[in-house]
């Protein structure tokens, strides 16, 4: 969490951002909030990116003002216009690219004063893994698949029954480049699986951590997945 205060001149206002991550090819949110104002026409929102000459996005007098927008963000940005009045300056970024990563500044001017806060935005690819039994394998085998990751993640298997066991000798992980030549499909197989156990396939890179669980008994096979973005620090 980054909390920024205004500079000299007018009163300072508090601006708060949260470091976040964008999933390339999908839409992302750069989160920013500020002390709200009564009049929408008095609010100016500017998004800037370190190393980029033009603006990422500008909103003033109740509407977008994109004449100074940098080419790389053309047609890809929007604020939540109906929520600006309540102090939401978050930016929606369409079709996130790897090159969108970097340091952004959310700069706010209201009748109360000015303020800004920086935001670290990471980009990559992350997806939920699904764990299934591989009935085609030569032994009792689980197959963990996740369609899109970047940068290349690590994959670790764990089991409820054999807690602390190292499964690296009985697992095999492969990374297959997807058609857009950036993201990769992750496939990991775990051999010599036993009944009445719960196995977890954990995929992690510096952006996200995802886990796929499978509980296997002769009367139930239960699957569960969850994904967590890393380093979501507010400022």
């Amino acid at each position: 969490l980054i909390i920024g205060f205004g500079i000299s001149g007018r009163h300072s206002i508090t601006v708060t951002t949260v470091a976040s991550a964008g999933n390339i090819g999908e839409d992302g949110i750069l989160s920013c909030t500020f002390e709200p104002d009564i009049k929408l026409s008095d609010i100016v929102i500017q998004w800037l990116k370190e190393g980029v000459i033009g603006l990422v996005h500008e909103f003033k007098e109740g509407k977008d003002e994109l004449s100074e927008q940098d080419e790389m963000f053309r047609g890809r940005t929007a604020v939540f216009a109906d929520q600006v009045i309540v102090g939401n300056a978050s930016l929606r970024l369409k079709n996130v690219q790897l090159t969108d990563a970097g340091t952004y500044k959310c700069y706010i001017i209201t009748s109360k004063g000015k303020g800004n806060a920086n935001l670290e935005y990471k980009t990559g690819a992350f997806s939920m893994p699904e764990v299934n039994v591989d009935y085609n394998a030569s032994s009792e085998t689980l197959r963990c698949e996740a369609p899109r990751w970047f940068p290349q993640p690590t994959v670790v298997w764990a089991s409820q029954v054999d807690q602390g066991a190292n499964f690296s000798e009985v697992s095999n992980t492969s990374f297959e480049l997807n058609s857009e030549n950036v993201t990769m499909k992750v496939v990991s197989v775990l051999y010599n699986v036993t009944i009445n156990n719960t196995y977890s396939c954990m995929i992690e890179n510096d952006i996200a951590k995802a886990t796929g669980d499978i509980k296997v008994t002769e009367s139930e096979i239960k699957r569960r997945s969850h994904l967590q973005l890393l380093n979501s620090k507010a400022s």
Partner: antibody, heavy 119, light 108 residues
């Protein structure tokens, strides 16, 4: 306990269709691959088809491919076998069987339903 | 397709004696083999999976062995309720899953 109950068998003329059902209970039906296995009178066992737990994949024996369709309704815990263009050689007791959790042996079988294809 | 061959087709054994049934796979199936018992008018019942693991509720007189292409089901001391037809099934490679032709164990 696991129970599989087939229904829908009967006498049918060659070239006609029949639909078998298998009602499952005693286990989480939606989690398991399900199979049909048949046995012609006085003969051995022949695997017919399998459907994956989420109905995303189906596989068939060559002898029924293109004529039989395996399906499932996980909301009703029921397995189906739609049999089209029936032949005399399809006459058999049809069993539904639950696939094992990790391998495809058959730990549980229904009692079977007899299909007779005759003019 | 993996072809499963069982021998003999019929085995005549006296109650209390040992019965040995064979099953051969046309190619290696590791330990991916099950054994089933079927009595007249009934559905098959799983006896052994993984070539040697007894299924739930199966008496200790039934044992399986073998790996690769050669497998054996042994009934150490035949009881009257054991006279039936026995099938082996491979689940290493599919489709199709394949069964042997069966061995009928009859009273001598």
């Amino acid at each position: 306990q696991v129970q599989l109950v087939e229904s829908g068998g009967g006498v049918v003329q060659p070239g006609r269709s029949l639909r078998l059902s298998c009602a499952a209970s005693g286990f989480t039906f939606r989690s398991f691959g399900m199979h049909w296995v048949r046995q012609a009178p006085g003969k051995g066992l022949e695997w017919v088809a399998v459907i994956s737990y989420d109905a995303s994949n189906e596989y068939y024996a060559d002898s029924v491919k293109g004529r039989f369709i395996i399906s499932r309704d996980n909301s009703k815990d029921t397995l189906y076998l739609q049999m089209n263009s029936l032949r005399a050689g399809d006459t058999a007791v049809y069993y539904c069987a639950k696939g094992g959790a990790l391998r495809w042996y058959f730990a549980y079988w229904g009692q079977g339903t007899l299909v007779t294809v005759s003019s | 397709e993996i072809v499963m061959t069982q021998s003999p087709a019929t085995l005549s054994v006296s109650p209390g004696e040992r019965a040995t049934l064979s099953c051969r796979a046309s190619q290696s199936i590791s330990s991916n083999l099950g054994w089933y018992q079927q009595k007249p008018g009934q559905a098959p019942r799983l006896l052994i999976y993984g070539a040697s693991t007894r299924a739930t509720g199966i008496p200790a007189r039934f044992s399986g062995s073998g790996s690769g292409t050669e497998f054996t089901l042994t009934i150490s001391s035949l009881q009257s309720e054991d006279f039936a037809v026995y099938y082996c099934q491979q689940y290493r490679s599919w489709p199709p899953l394949t069964f042997g032709g069966g061995t009928k164990v009859e009273i001598k």
